[in-house]
Interface confidence: medium
């Protein structure tokens, strides 16, 4: 369907009935009869044809082809072309339910001049003109536009049709009749009347024998197919293309006859080689011929059509393109057209429907839809613009939040977070003892760099993990008494041993870190200060990175905090092994630098609870 | 890098003519429609014209309000668009862009904007 | 012609606020809809084409939703270079229309 952008390019001469130029007596008629045009079954039909409940009202266009293809580039309307009147005038109303449009009154008729080519091809286009208060006059969009290819006879009774066009849904019938004296299937054997002279008259082409009884039904061959076959002398089966054996039941395909041309033997079935149908040329005015199975077919130049390009003289007052083409023509009304076609059509005419998306369009494995009004592509992650030609730039736009520094690559953003923030977009406050990682009642403390887990008597590890005994016999002296449940227990050491554990645990702490920045160089710096102990919550009792946490007023860790648990946190920080004779009370400054900026020579602290433990670790 | 210049504004009076252009660079002129868009002092956008690319013709459409009284052309040689304006009125004064439309097939409807350029009607 | 009503035109909001503009059609558009940021100097810039279509370099708490032919403009957390004039584009059909705009203002 035609977006309404359409209905501006289409020329206002074409809407002018078809001007059909002098020409000899047609050889016949082929008609079309509109029976419907409305919404089809299911969901999603329009209500209306009218927009925005503008009085609006149909009229059709139909274009008819021979041979096979409807779909031909360079195959204008070459059996001819006809334009109905306007249909009533219809308004919607409101509530109403849908109903079948008024239409036209009257068949769609399309003379064709020579022989009827039994194979045809049409396109019938549904146009509704709105008769609103435009600028301008009128205006015109394609409704629906429906294209088949079909085996016909002349002579025959009235074939039925239904087309969908989207979600259009269009009833006809058709026929090909031949003009007397005209007759046959082909309407190319020619008659008199009883009373009239036995001549060729003038016009009458191809000046063939006469018949006195031109009433008499022709009969063909007994069981000759109604389908694919026909007859043009009684008794006889003559093969449609596509078709071939005595009673024209074998498709081509699986015949083993050989040459193209000639008529069809009654014996073989198979075609007798004949004179080509291209010798001599039959194509005026520079056309070009081409064989068919049955006959010929020419390709015009621009301004010429007909089946054998004799008919000249075309202009855009003939309303020659299809599909919402801009008709450009010279002054002259001899000039020949030029057809400007809108996006998604090609040919001479328009007539040729493209599949833009085949030329796959959209760049970076983007999907192509074709809408009709434009092409659309729907991107991968990481691209963008309307072919998905642009690389994202992730970090357009400051994409990271409170100071976070954006690393661009594999179209999703990522980012490297400052001290203290965390998630996708650095807008969230990190939590990495959310998780509770600590094991056996350990404590769990938010660090610059991860977290530090200061475990329970008899346990060890970065996670509390180990027992400090495996047999379960600690090496350490009972907590003294005087301790709060749920207070970190404290050890009273002499200072010397207490730097001598606390020299180990430094060690320890330090080729970690040696281990973890080796193989984990690319970790976001986005872990923070902050605690949650298992089971209660607790923090560090300083405020550190931006936490805010209200002093308690003991030695232990303060009860009130303030933090945002986080979206994605890695729980692979950097770890103290502790001993359960130290209570990390203090980290006044980072332990380690955040692995992402290595700021080397840093002097960093760890606090214990008395000032002989405080160690300095280059 | 696409690239859209106006220039030709100023102070004319009510009743008379000018012409604005449009510079632009950075993509292939022909290949895409172009619009004129005006703002009126502290007014919404409003569309004027278009012209359509190559492939089409170099049709144009217009809005209603300028109908008659305006035409949009193009240079395509020099890449330049243009608004001929004519029978001016004080209601015409306002701060005139170009914008890039569509190249026929994909949607890059007003996806570049020139700096605008100021025209005033008045006595 | 296509209306198009553009709501709130005036609207306060601070920073790290998020924030909502509409614009309904006055007739069927499908999805053929653009949003556009005015800047105090009057640079214009197209954010979202096709209704929901994040143009390249515009930051990703910019993003655009339909619901038949109501058209919304959402901004997530809003920044500083936010603070604007906003205004949506039907390119459905001739005449193109605007919405009346929204300015954006900082609280």
């Known amino acids: 369907m035609v977006s309404p952008r359409m209905s501006g390019l289409l020329s206002q001469t074409v809407i002018l009935a078809l001007i059909f130029l002098p020409q000899t007596r047609p050889a016949g008629v082929f008609e079309l009869q509109i029976h419907s045009f409305g919404p089809g079954p299911g969901p999603g039909a329009p209500r209306s044809p009218c927009s925005a409940r503008l009085p609006c009202r149909l009229f059709f266009r139909v274009c008819l082809k021979p041979g096979l293809s409807e779909e031909a580039a360079e195959s204008p309307c070459a059996l001819g072309a006809a334009l109905s009147a306007r249909g009533p005038v219809y308004t919607e109303q409101p509530g109403a339910p849908a109903p079948d449009l008024p239409l036209p009154d009257g068949l769609l008729q399309v003379p064709f001049r020579d022989a009827w080519p039994g194979t045809f091809s049409f396109i019938i286009e549904t146009w509704r003109e709105e008769l609103g208060d435009q600028i301008g006059g009128p205006a015109w969009s394609l409704l629906a536009r429906v294209a088949g290819r079909r085996r016909l006879a002349a002579g025959g009774p009235w074939a039925r049709d239904i087309q969908r066009a989207g979600a259009w849904e269009l009833r006809f019938s058709y026929r090909a009749r031949c003009e007397p004296p005209a007759v046959g299937t082909a309407c190319t054997r020619l008659c008199r009347p009883r009373s009239a002279p036995s001549r060729c008259g003038p016009g009458l082409r191809p000046c063939a024998p006469l018949e006195d009884e031109c009433e008499a039904p022709l009969v063909c061959r007994a069981g000759c197919s109604p389908e694919h076959g026909f007859c043009e002398q009684p008794g006889e089966c003559r093969c449609l293309e596509g078709w071939t054996g005595p009673l024209c039941t074998v498709p081509v395909s699986t015949s083993s006859c050989l040459s193209p041309r000639g008529p069809s033997s009654a014996t073989t079935g198979c075609l007798v080689p004949g004179p080509g149908p291209c010798d001599g040329n039959p194509c005026a005015n520079g056309g070009s011929c081409s064989e068919t199975p049955r006959s010929f077919e020419c390709t015009c130049p621009r301004g010429f059509y007909g089946l054998r390009c004799e008919v000249s003289g075309v202009t855009c007052a003939d309303g020659p393109c299809f599909n919402g083409g801009l008709c450009v023509g010279g002054a002259d009304p001899d000039s020949a057209y030029i057809c400007h076609c809108p996006p998604g059509f090609q040919g001479s005419n328009c007539e040729k429907r493209v599949d833009r998306c085949s030329l796959q369009p959209c760049r970076n494995g983007g999907l192509c839809l074709d809408l009709g009004h434009a092409l659309r592509c729907r991107c991968r992650a990481g691209f963008a613009g309307p072919r998905c030609e642009h690389d994202l730039d992730d970090c357009a736009g400051r994409a990271c939040a409170n100071g976070g520094t954006c690393v661009e690559g594999g179209g999703a953003h990522r980012c490297s977070c400052a001290l203290g923030f965390g998630g996708r977009d650095c807008r969230e406050r990190a939590d990495p003892c959310a998780a509770r990682p600590c094991a056996h009642g350990g404590r769990c403390y938010a660090h610059f760099s991860g977290l530090v887990c200061a475990c329970a008597p008899g346990y060890m590890g970065a996670r509390c993990e180990f027992p400090v005994h495996p047999d379960g016999a600690s090496a350490l002296p009972a907590a003294p008494p005087g301790l709060r449940p749920g207070d970190p227990q404290r050890y009273l050491l002499p200072p010397a041993l207490g730097l001598l554990v606390a020299a180990g645990v430094a060690g320890a702490a330090l080729l970690l870190v040696h281990v973890r920045r080796r193989g984990h160089s690319q970790d976001a710096g986005s872990r923070l200060l902050a605690g949650t102990p298992e089971p209660s919550v607790h923090a560090l009792p300083d405020a550190l990175n931006n936490l805010r946490t209200q002093e308690g007023s003991g030695d232990g860790p303060s009860s009130s905090v303030d933090w945002n648990r986080p979206e994605d946190v890695d729980p692979q920080g950097i770890y103290v092994i502790s001993a359960p004779s130290i209570y990390a009370r203090e980290v006044a400054t980072p332990l380690f630098p955040p692995l992402h900026t290595g700021r080397a020579g840093q002097r960093q602290h760890l606090l214990f609870p008395y000032p002989s433990s405080i160690l300095s670790v280059k | 890098e696409v690239k859209l210049v106006e220039s030709g504004g100023g102070l004319v009076q009510p009743g008379g003519s000018l012409s604005l252009s449009c510079a632009a660079s950075?993509?292939?002129?022909?290949?895409?429609?172009m619009n004129w868009v005006r703002q009126p002092p502290g007014k919404a956008l409003e569309w004027l014209a278009l012209i359509r690319n190559k492939a089409n013709g170099y049709t144009t459409e217009y809005n209603a309000s300028v109908k008659g009284r305006f035409t949009i052309s193009r240079d395509n040689s020099q890449n330049i668009l243009y608004l001929q304006m004519n029978a001016l009125r004080a209601e015409d004064s306002a701060t005139y862009y170009c914008?890039?439309?569509?190249?026929?097939?994909?949607?890059?409807?007003?996806?570049?904007w020139g700096q605008g350029t100021t025209l005033t009607v008045s006595s | 012609d296509i209306q198009m009503t553009q709501s709130p035109s005036s609207l306060s909001a601070s920073l790290g606020e998020r924030v909502s503009l509409t614009c309904r059609a006055s007739?069927?558009?499908?999805?053929?809809l653009s949003w556009l940021q005015q800047k105090p100097d009057g640079t214009i810039k197209r954010l979202i084409f096709a209704a929901s279509t994040l143009d390249s370099g515009v930051p990703k708490r910019f993003s655009g939703s339909r619901s038949g032919s109501d058209f919304s403009l959402s901004i997530s957390s809003l920044e500083s270079e936010d603070f604007a004039d906003y205004y949506c584009?039907?390119?459905?059909?001739?005449?193109?229309?605007f919405g009346s705009g929204t300015k954006l203002e900082i609280k």
């Open positions: 950075g993509f292939t002129f022909t290949d895409y429609y």
């Open positions: 584009l039907q390119y459905a059909s001739y005449p193109y229309t």
């Open positions: 914008a890039r439309d569509s190249d026929g097939y994909y949607e890059y409807y007003f996806d570049y």
């Open positions: 007739q069927e558009i499908s999805d053929y």
